[in-house]
Every structure is written in C-alpha cells, then in structure tokens.
Interface confidence: low
C-alpha cells in the first residue's frame, strides 16, 4: 500500500520534524504550510485550518519561502550616485549600485552603502590596475620610454614614438616630438582604453587594495583624513 | 543645514577604552538608521557597526564583536561606540553616518571623523 500523505496542518511523528516549505507552529503544535516568495501569512494555521497567505502589498517583498505576518519594506529610491539594477518586486527588493565611473568602497549585504569616484590618474601617470566594481583604481608613474599625456581613469602609459632625428626628447607625461616628417615608427596612435567595469550586481566583498596604493575616498567626505594618492586627482 | 559631529577619539593604549560621540542635527535623527565606519591608513573603509532608529536592533563587524558597544540616545540626537579592549588594529578616522531612509540604504549623511590612534 502506498504510504499516506499527510496533508496540513498535521501533527508531526515524535522527533520528526516538518517536510520542505511547511514549518512547525508552537501555539498549534501542528506541521503548516509556508507561504510562497511574494506573499506573506496573513492568518497563522491552527489545529484544524492551514496557514493563510495573502500577497505581499506594493513596495513590499519576501524573497524566500516564509510565515512572516507582514513583508518586508523596499529600500527607498537610489542615491544620486548610484543606479538601480534590481527593482522592488513582491519577491525581491530593489538594488542599488554604484553608476559608472564610481566604484563601491563600502558593502552592504545587497548592492552598495557607499560609491566613490574612481580616481584618475594625472598627466605622467597610467593605469596600472582598472578599477572594479569594488576596488578603484590604481595608477603607477609611467616608465622611462612611456608617457601619459591625459587625466584619466581608463589610460595607461604608452610608449614614445620613435623618432629619426628628436626635436623635444619624450618624458613622462609627454610624447617625443620628431624633427623629420614623419618618426621610423610610431607606437603611439592614441590613448590606449581599458574597459570600464560592467555594471551588474554588486559583489559582496569588502575592497581590499594594497595599503601603497590604496585609494583615499576621502574627497567624499566633509574632511577627510588623508589626500588622494600621489599620481591621482580627485576631479 | 545636517550636520554630524564626532568627538571622543584620541590616543589610548592597547588594551584601554574610548567612548566616542556623534551629536546629529538638521535631519530626523530619531527615524534614521545609524553607522559608524571607519578608515584605515591605508583609506580602506570598513563597516563597524550600526543601530535601528528605536536602538533594539544592533549590528558588529566580526572584527569588534564583544569589544564596541553602539547605543543612541534619541533624545539627545546623539549616538555613541564605547570601545573596549582596543588594539593597534582599531587605529583609524571613525565616521559616524546616517541613512534616513530615502536613499536606498546608502549612507547620505556623514561627520568629518574623529581619529583613534592606538598605540602598543
């Protein structure tokens, strides 16, 4: 015979507990059902009647399966520095994370508590790591042989061109200039890009730079206890 | 005008205490919730603690557990981290900063920092 399914509520064997999406309330010492992503209970089981659920009003969720009398607020609207990439739903709250060009310098559980600018490096500066959507970025001073002419947070140092004749020697934030026509070859046609981080969900790490190179976010705030690094601007 | 304005923070030798204060005004205090963050030298910022605006509910970094105490007296607009058993670790600017609840759970409003230096 096959075994008989209980349906709830039901009164669970001594020491068993309750199957998958149904939980055990105290008050009816009795096996009840959950109530379902998007909804919430609004009538808690008794002996003899199953869990009422009800859905979860607006700007109002519950994620997981669930026997909380009420759901559980939204977040409000996004800060101006960030973008919405997940939108309240009855079964999801909203996500905000940092706009392009910022990054999170500071988690939360979903999404992002604070977004910082990404720093740029100055003129004589490149990229020496892009920035993430949880770390900024890191600039180096550009090597003997290499230039970056620009304030950026993408550029990275470049070689110089290679001239015949050198009318201006190359340094480190300016290209060579060539007396002849044209130089033998050039190995700078232009600012060479690092992507931009894609802005999907935030990832739930705390940033960790290196302390040397480590960013100061401190442009941020009213007064901040230490200037950006040297090799970046805040602007 | 907002304005969050931290005091307290000091010298003190591993092992001792502080109690640091964050005195709020020009926005609903009562209603917000509270953090405190703090920055390392190396300017990474980390999450320390923070309260629900009616004080019930308290949240620690695994890093200050059983040590920092948040608590917040909504009359006087003020919230406070009483530190204990300090280590050279803590070293940091400690901000306090506020989420009035239109902003998506960011952190809209912040103090300018009160250093803590702990000293071995």
């Known amino acids: 015979l096959p075994a008989q399914v209980a349906f709830t509520p039901y009164a669970p064997e001594p020491g068993s507990t309750c199957r998958l999406r149904e939980y055990y309330d105290q008050t009816a010492q009795m096996c009840c059902s959950k109530c379902s992503p998007g909804q919430h209970a609004k009538v808690f089981c008794t002996k003899t009647s199953d869990t009422v659920c009800d859905s979860c009003e607006d700007s109002t969720y519950t994620q997981l399966w669930n026997w909380v009398p009420e759901c559980l607020s939204c977040g409000s609207r996004c800060s101006s520095d960030q973008v919405e990439t997940q939108a309240c739903t009855r079964e999801q709250n909203r996500i905000c994370t940092c706009r392009p060009g910022w990054y999170c310098a500071l988690s939360k559980q979903e999404g992002c508590r604070l977004c910082a600018p990404l720093r740029k490096c100055r003129p004589g500066f490149g990229v020496a790591r892009p920035g993430t959507e949880t770390s900024d970025v890191v600039c180096k001073p550009c090597a003997p042989g290499t230039f970056s002419n620009t304030t950026s947070s993408t550029d990275i140092c470049r070689p110089h061109q290679i001239c015949n004749v050198v009318a201006i020697p190359g340094n480190a934030s300016m290209d060579a200039v060539c007396t002849s026509t044209s130089p033998t070859r050039s190995m700078a046609p232009g600012a060479v890009h690092l992507p931009q981080p894609v802005s999907t969900r935030s990832q739930h790490t705390q940033p960790t730079p290196e302390p040397s190179t480590a960013p100061s976010t401190s442009f941020l705030l009213p007064m901040g206890p230490s200037p950006p690094a040297e090799g970046s601007t805040g602007d | 005008d907002v304005q969050l304005v931290e005091s307290g923070g000091g010298l003190v030798q591993s092992g001792g205490s502080l109690r640091l204060s964050c005195a709020a005004s020009?926005?609903?205090?009562?209603?917000?919730?509270m953090t405190w963050v703090r920055q390392t030298s190396g300017s990474v910022f980390e999450w320390v603690s923070d309260?629900?605006?009616?004080?019930?509910?308290?949240r620690y970094a695994d890093s200050v557990k059983g040590r920092f105490i948040i608590s917040r007296d909504n009359a006087k607009s003020t919230l406070y981290l009483q530190m204990d058993s300090l280590k050279t670790d803590d070293t940091a600017v400690y901000y306090c900063?506020?989420?009035?609840?239109?902003?998506?759970?960011?952190?809209?409003?912040w103090g300018k920092g009160t250093l803590v230096t702990v000293s071995s």
């Open positions: 020009g926005f609903p205090f009562s209603s917000s919730d």
């Open positions: 309260i629900n605006p009616d004080g019930q509910n308290t």
């Open positions: 900063a506020a989420d009035p609840g239109s902003s998506g759970g960011s952190l809209s409003y």
